[in-house]
Interface confidence: low
């Protein structure tokens, strides 16, 4: 096979959330990120080539304790495929009870076109470090 | 390509932490650990390939109940490009907070020579229990 | 080498649960689970190629407040080789605390033949949701 | 008990500058988003800028814009604001506030110093 | 002109109950304008009663509420008490990245 779709994206919040999408980016102004085949439409990752993918995030919340967390609950964060909309569907949720960090990863089935949107549902800030918050695809086969 | 660089380390504490590195191990005298191609120097793993890798790990605190991990918060576990200085950077980064495992997973580019370091602040000690305290890397593309 | 042996599994519980063993399925009547190489036997997961794999897991518990967690700890998931009897290991473990969900995963070496089992120790019930709860593994190299 | 206070205020002349800091202690100042607030005297609040945590993201009011810069050193567990081209209108008492991170939306000031007063005139 | 309005000064007895609005010149206030209420007292900082609409910040006695009356924000404090005597400032979000203030509300206690 050529070298496998990949992607590592930093969280790219550049105005206050108004909805619970987050908007990711990459690239030497974003920490040690980038894309390899899949691309990023108005901060959301879009496949270009069919497979099973190893999807994995990490998000943590800013300013926060597990008083915090335990307080704003419930904090739910969920990986989904949001377009096109015959495909949508939830690949992955968590939430944050009373802990400051979810990670988690699957393998899925992605095609070319699926676009992934992360949804951070609550009213907590997720932090922008980059070695706190970040969200990435690994083909992994056809 | 020929066969992807891999490892997967065990906790190899011999002596109680002084510093907040924590110091890996590989071989049958640690569970079932091994390093095909990045090396272990001094207890920190060595990078042999430059490429994009995907680097895990999980910690456990030894001696722990969420009412330990919130006493002695924060512990963070951080992994990073330790040396050469030039390229030192945190990769990844978590806190315990109420709970007594962390574990999460990124990919990131790294280069031949690249040394990884893992540190946990805090006063509390990790688990050397070879299914609960692991770190591990795999070559994914160049 | 042929393409890489892969799984994702969902939760496959059509009894309640009087053994700690989770029980997993794929196929389209299980949201977007598959296994490419690997074999579900009884709900347990049978490996057919050697090598390395990397293995990955969530669980999330069913009607889980931080207080459920708590009250019910403690809740563990251990992910192991239970047969060939002579192979018998635990690869992974983590308890919930406070929290209702882990994840995880690792790199470790797996042979023909090894049957992977998930048990999940405590009163509390996973959830069936395909996002929240999945197991897989993912060949890696020989 | 969380403490802000705020040192550098004074009477300076248009087109001048002057340089703000605020000390914190009582909390771990580097987790904490840092905003400052001006409040001019008998009227009302205005948001002036803001700083993240680690000090990479900030941002300002359109009637500071160009002309202040907020900083932040965490191992002094302290903020500044460096005002330049100063003017009569941003006469004003300037207080140091802590974002709650109660919001992924807005800051929230959960904490504020008493404040330091800027004069400008001539 | 203030984007934000609110009444200039309002006034309630001891133990009455009284409600102070926060408004956009154009438009209505809705939650997604995560409406804030700050109290202030002569010659102290500014200090945080309740955030996001509706959620008392810690430590604030539970006679300050939050809401959306009709097309503004309000903040309803019963069995009004003479230290509640202070000027209230409310802060909306209007556009990217900044709140803004209201140019606050004096109350008075009369005792």
């Known amino acids: 096979h050529p070298e496998p779709h990949t992607a590592e994206l930093q969280l790219n919040l550049t105005v206050p959330r108004k909805d619970p999408t987050l908007r990711w980016g990459a690239g030497p102004a974003l920490g040690r990120s980038f894309t390899h085949g899949p691309e990023l439409d108005k901060g959301q990752l879009r496949i270009h080539r069919d497979g099973i993918y190893m999807v994995h995030i990490q998000v943590t919340l800013a300013i926060c304790s597990s008083t915090t967390a335990s307080r704003h609950h419930p904090t739910t964060l969920a990986v989904g495929i949001c377009s096109p909309a015959s495909r949508s569907i939830s690949l992955l949720r968590l939430s944050f009870h009373q802990g400051c960090t979810i990670a988690s990863q699957r393998l899925t089935p992605l095609a070319r076109g699926d676009t992934l949107c992360t949804n951070l549902t609550g009213t907590l800030l997720p932090s922008r470090n980059t070695d706190e918050t970040f969200f990435g695809v690994q083909w992994v086969r056809p | 390509h020929p066969e992807p660089h891999t490892a997967e380390l065990q906790l190899n504490l011999t002596v109680p932490r002084k510093d907040p590195t924590l110091r890996w191990g590989a071989g049958p005298a640690l569970g079932r650990s091994f390093t095909h191609g990045p090396e272990l120097d001094k207890g920190q793993l060595r990078i042999h390939r430059d490429g994009i890798y995907m680097v895990h790990i999980q910690v456990t605190l030894a001696i722990c109940s969420s009412t330990t991990a919130s006493r002695h918060h924060p512990t963070t576990l951080a992994v990073g490009i330790c040396s050469p200085a030039s390229r030192s950077i945190s990769l990844l980064r978590l806190s315990f907070h109420q709970g007594c495992t962390i574990a999460s997973q990124r990919l990131t580019p790294l280069a031949r020579g690249d040394t990884l370091c893992t540190n946990l602040t805090g006063t509390l000690l990790p688990s050397r229990n070879t299914d609960e305290t692991f770190f591990g890397v795999q070559w994914v593309r160049p | 080498h042929p393409e890489p042996h892969t799984a994702e599994l969902q939760l496959n519980l059509t009894v309640p649960r009087k053994d700690p063993t989770l029980r997993w399925g794929a196929g389209p009547a299980l949201g977007r689970s598959f296994t490419h190489g690997p074999e579900l036997d009884k709900g347990q997961l049978r490996i057919h190629r050697d090598g390395i794999y990397m293995v990955h897991i969530q669980v999330t518990l069913a009607i889980c407040s931080s207080t459920t967690a708590s009250r019910h700890h403690p809740t563990t998931l251990a992910v192991g080789i239970c047969s060939p009897a002579s192979r018998s290991i635990s690869l992974l473990r983590l308890s919930f605390h406070q929290g209702c969900t882990i994840a995880s995963q690792r790199l470790t070496p797996l042979a023909r033949g090894d049957t992977l089992c998930t048990n999940l120790t405590g009163t509390l019930l996973p959830s069936r949701n395909t996002d929240e709860t999945f197991f897989g593994v993912q060949w890696v190299r020989p | 008990e969380v403490q802000l206070v705020e040192s550098g205020g004074g009477l300076v002349q248009p087109g001048g500058s002057l340089r703000l800091s605020c000390a914190a202690s009582g909390f771990t100042f580097s987790v904490y988003y840092m905003n400052w607030v001006r409040q001019a005297p008998g009227k009302g609040l205005e948001w002036v800028s803001d700083i993240n945590n680690e000090g990479g993201t900030t941002y300002y009011a359109d009637s500071v814009k160009g002309r202040f810069t907020i900083s932040r050193d965490n191992s002094k567990n302290s903020l500044y604001l460096q005002m330049n081209s100063l003017r009569a209108e941003d006469t004003a008492v300037y207080y140091c506030?802590?974002?709650?991170?109660?919001?992924?939306?807005?800051?929230?000031?959960?904490?504020w110093g008493q404040g330091t007063l800027v004069t400008v005139s001539s | 002109q203030a984007v934000v309005t609110q009444e200039p000064s309002l006034t309630v007895s001891p133990g009455g109950t009284v409600t102070l609005t926060c408004g956009l010149k154009?438009?209505?206030?809705?939650?997604?304008?995560?409406p804030t209420w700050y109290q202030q007292t002569p010659g102290q900082a500014p200090r945080l009663l309740i955030y996001n609409t509706n959620t008392r910040h810690s430590g604030v006695p539970d006679r300050f509420s939050g809401s959306i009356l009709g097309n503004k924000a309000a903040l309803t404090i019963t069995g009004a008490q003479a230290d509640d005597e202070a000027e209230y400032f409310c802060?909306?979000?209007?556009?990217?990245?900044?709140?803004?203030f209201g140019g606050g509300t004096q109350l008075t206690v009369l005792g």
């Open positions: 154009s438009g209505s206030v809705t939650s997604d304008n995560f």
């Open positions: 506030a802590r974002d709650a991170g109660y919001s992924n939306h807005v800051p929230i000031f959960d904490s």
């Open positions: 802060a909306l979000f209007i556009s990217n990245p900044s709140v803004e």
